[in-house]
């Protein structure tokens, strides 16, 4: 798969493949994988990709299911790249406070916060 | 501060305190703090709280600015708790796939994805 494919298109294609291959992926009825119990997905990327690794090792490869796991590995690459960008730029305190304010604003409006 | 205060209320109060104390916090003109260069904030919680730590060590404590840093420390506690919940429950593959689908769906619709 060319890595030049835009990440947004990659995500869309992966969603479709995930749906198509659901019964193949759940063929191992006894396998158990850690599943986060909240919806703040970005906090759990490490565990999600560990789970994907477990699933891949238990899944017969070939055809488009192989493409699914390739896509997921490219998505992981993208996310790892984003994580690297978390600490790359050293800026003035004003700019850090702006980011902190945005972060708390997002927490305030978009996070699913349990009591 | 009683930890019983709901996290949502804590976040709101912290946003207000951040605004109130902005000039005090930016008093150190030479200080530089790593600032993420993208808006997928949840990926950068570690760096954000490291930055808060740097800022706290450089800020004269007392009064409500102390309350601001206490709040931020409680928010960190909440996020650390959420991160712990990423891998607590081992479930069937079906449920892992549901979570993965939600995660990709959120990436598809809510993430700011650069080409």
């Amino acid at each position: 798969i060319p890595t030049e494919i835009p990440t947004s298109a990659l995500v869309k294609e992966t969603l479709a493949l995930l749906s198509t291959h659901r019964t193949l992926l759940i063929a191992n009825e006894t396998l158990r994988i850690p599943v986060p119990v909240h919806k703040n997905h970005q906090l759990c990327t490490e565990e999600i990709f560990q789970g994907i690794g477990t699933l891949e090792s238990q899944t017969v490869q070939g055809g488009t299911v192989e493409r699914l796991f390739k896509n997921l590995s490219l998505i992981k690459k993208y996310i790892d790249g984003q994580k690297k960008k978390c600490g790359e730029e050293r800026r003035r305190v004003n700019q850090f406070l702006d980011y902190l304010q945005e972060f708390l604003g997002v927490m305030n409006t978009e996070w699913i916060i349990e009591s | 501060i009683p930890t019983e205060i709901p996290t949502s209320a804590l976040v709101k109060e912290t946003l207000a305190l951040l605004s109130t104390h902005r000039t005090l916090l930016i008093a150190n003109e030479t200080l530089r703090i790593p600032v993420p260069v993208h808006k997928n904030h949840q990926l950068c919680t570690e760096e954000i709280f490291q930055g808060i730590g740097t800022l706290e060590s450089q800020t004269v404590q007392g009064g409500t600015v102390e309350r601001l840093f206490k709040n931020l420390s409680l928010i960190k506690k909440y996020i650390d708790g959420q991160k712990k919940k990423c891998g607590e429950e081992r479930r069937r593959v079906n449920q892992f796939l549901d979570y993965l689908q939600e995660f990709l769906g959120v990436m598809n619709t809510e993430w700011i994805i650069e080409s």
């Epitope: 198509t20 019964t23 063929a27 191992n28 | 449920q95």
Partner: antibody, heavy 119, light 107 residues
Framework: EVQLVQSGAEVKKPGASVKVSCKAS????????IHWVRQAPGQGLEWMGY????????VYNEKFKSRVTMTRDTSISTAYMELSRLRSDDTAVYYC????????????WGQGTMVTVSS | EIVLTQSPATLSLSPGERATLSCRAS??????MHWYQQKPGQAPRLLIY???NLASGIPARFSGSGSGTDFTLTISSLEPEDFAVYYC?????????FGGGTKVEIK
């Protein structure tokens, strides 16, 4: 159009077995799980288990584990549910239902097969 | 196994009224709750999946909410065809279980 068509009503003696079929059409049979749910007269719904048509793997409700067998024939897009050692309290309408995928809701149902167990 | 308790057992309402049906789980099941409608002599029909998502072809007057142990199905304005039995169902834990049903009848 998705359709699940079940076999006709059955009358069985206690101790006998019954095999109900469920023919799927309008979608790719191997891409969705098939569940079996029963409903005794005037009662609520009871989940019996499911079969994965792709792999043939099954997950059964512990209550039925020793008596139920779910199979499928992918060549004719049909799932089967066999219940053995029938008792009078197995008298019920037996439904097959397709699993909708994400979060596993039962999105399409067969018309039901009435199984009467009586001596 | 997770026990689902539906209340009330019977709900007597007139067309146009709002119906609120409750389903309580004996233990937390995140949002793995689905709702079905069943009319006499018919198979159940999926209305709401994963607590709050409207199933395909279902009118927008049906809505679901809740998470954890408490869930609600709401019919904003009852139509004559809505008088039926409603079941909640969980699939967070095996075995999957259904509630005992709530009958919505014409007052």
């Amino acid at each position: 159009e998705v359709q699940l068509v079940q076999s006709g009503a059955e009358v069985k003696k206690p101790g006998a077995s019954v095999k109900v079929s469920c023919k799927a059409s309008g979608y790719t049979f191997t891409e969705y799980l098939i569940h079996w749910v029963r409903q005794a007269p005037g009662q609520g719904l009871e989940w019996m288990g499911y079969i994965n048509p792709y792999s043939g793997g099954t997950v059964y409700n512990e209550k039925f584990k020793s008596r139920v067998t779910m199979t499928r024939d992918t060549s004719i897009s049909t799932a089967y549910m066999e219940l053995s050692r029938l008792r009078s309290d197995d008298t019920a309408v037996y439904y097959c239902a397709r699993d909708g995928g994400y979060s596993d809701p039962l999105d399409y149902w067969g018309q039901g097969t009435m199984v009467t167990v009586s001596s | 196994e997770i026990v689902l308790t539906q209340s009330p057992a019977t709900l007597s309402l007139s067309p146009g009224e709002r119906a609120t049906l409750s389903c309580r789980a004996s233990e937390g099941l995140t949002s793995y709750m689905h709702w079905y409608q069943q009319k006499p002599g018919q198979a159940p029909r999926l209305l709401i999946y994963k607590a709050s998502n409207l199933a395909s072809g279902i009118p927008a007057r049906f809505s679901g909410s809740g998470s954890g142990t408490d869930f609600t199905l709401t019919i904003s304005s009852l139509e004559p065809e809505d008088f039926a039995v409603y079941y909640c169902q969980q699939n967070w834990n095996d075995p999957w279980t259904f509630g005992g049903g709530t009958k919505v009848e014409i007052k």
